[in-house]
Amino acid sequence: YNVFPRTLKWSKMNLTYRIVNYTPDMTHSEVEKAFKKAFKVWSDVTPLNFTRLHDGIADIMISFGIKEHGDFYPFDGPSGLLAHAFPPGPNYGGDAHFDDDETWTSSSKGYNLFLVAAHEFGHSLGLDHSKDPGALMFPIYTYTGKSHFMLPDDDVQGIQSLYGPGDEDPNPKHPKTPDKCDPSLSLDAITSLRGETMIFKDRFFWRLHPQQVDAELFLTKSFWPELPNRIDAAYEHPSHDLIFIFRGRKFWALNGYDILEGYPKKISELGLPKEVKKISAAVHFEDTGKTLLFSGNQVWRYDDTNHIMDKDYPRLIEEDFPGIGDKVDAVYEKNGYIYFFNGPIQFEYSIWSNRIVRVMPANSILWC
């Protein structure tokens, strides 16, 4: 997190706000609800209280405007700048302005007013942009989904560095951004994609370029807004320029950042029995056209060419790949070796000699 220079903050805990005008894109009630919810994000984790005024001067004046709107920081028409807010202080201090050339919504269409307001009110309270891609105060807008919003840990640390913690946090679970060099790091899924490696963990993935040590961290939804926040398994089908993503009983086929028509589908359509609730890991072998699908302590082999599950499956993981344990969290194949991830450990397994040749920390894939 980052605070503004000179640690600008309010010297009182009871703050007022006023909605000066409204966007035509939403009902008054929807706008009021979005702003109330956005303030609650911050009051839940601090001693701050927010009270709405209907007239007069409030600490935080909220308005919608277009282009030059009275503060010498003009908006720019659709897209580009969504809004801005001033750090704590007198006059303009704390005020938040929203570009009414955007389409404001309470969904994923256009721009989600609650999400942008929560970010802007972070500025109104003294937070600058964060370098943590999981933070609400990260400068890039990402719609994070319909489920209950949870303020990320980085933002909690930031706002509490200014105002301290509140009495009782009603939502004490604050998602942390994974640390790639945490020795206990386990991974959710791994796949190649157009020559790069995508390593999924929680709401994020690391994107690792070949011959590069520094993996970039992204929110999964910043690339694929329609996917769930977390995924279970993934594999690439390079000859078709597709990747397949699994979550629960559903799976998606993606070309770049586009979901193919007809997806998501049910994993039972692949020939898996109905009692299989999720795929924990998947890996595709381009030379044979086969894909291994792991669930629990079992493995299935799917024929991607003929779209049929191979006979004699499922089999026990321990029988087919002795020594790797009875579950697989993530898996990928490279140069004749399969890399199986089980908790914080990965096993390098030789296809040629059918045995484990190396055991390494899971995060060595991230050059830790």
């Epitope: 659709p78 897209s79 580009g80 700048l81 955007e102 389409t103 807008y141 157009r194 770049g256």
Partner: nanobody, 120 residues
């Protein structure tokens, strides 16, 4: 780094048509807006047509009804179909893309430009 490559410019008579295309080589980097601007000699660069962040289209008044912007998401490509071209449409046409930011300026990504000349 987003790289934009335009094609389709050329010399055309008044009343004629051209189709410009712009391809973004981005891997799977998500683009927010993508569209076309133009710059006539001695003038500033102006918006012609763009896809906004919410998938709507926006056109300059001077091209409405004559130009149509379209795109192919799978290919990260945007097109500009220009009909009933006029001499005043003569300009270098630039492809433009941005990413979504909250309140700081998005990086602007520009193509090299393709020349369109309307003359008899």
């Amino acid at each position: 780094e987003v790289q934009l490559v335009e094609s389709g410019g050329g010399l055309v008579q008044p009343g004629g048509s051209l189709r410009l295309s712009c391809s973004a080589s981005t891997g799977i980097f998500r683009i927010n807006t993508m569209g076309w601007h133009r710059q006539a000699p001695g003038k500033q660069r102006d918006l012609v047509a763009t896809f906004t962040s919410d998938d709507n289209t926006k056109y300059a008044d001077s091209v409405k009804g004559r130009f149509t912007i379209s795109r192919d998401n799978a290919e990260n490509t945007v097109y500009l179909q220009m009909n009933d071209l006029k001499p005043e449409d003569t300009a270098v046409y630039y492809c433009h893309a941005t990413t979504v930011m909250y309140d700081s300026n998005s990086p602007d990504y520009w193509g090299q430009g393709t020349q369109v000349t309307v003359s008899s």
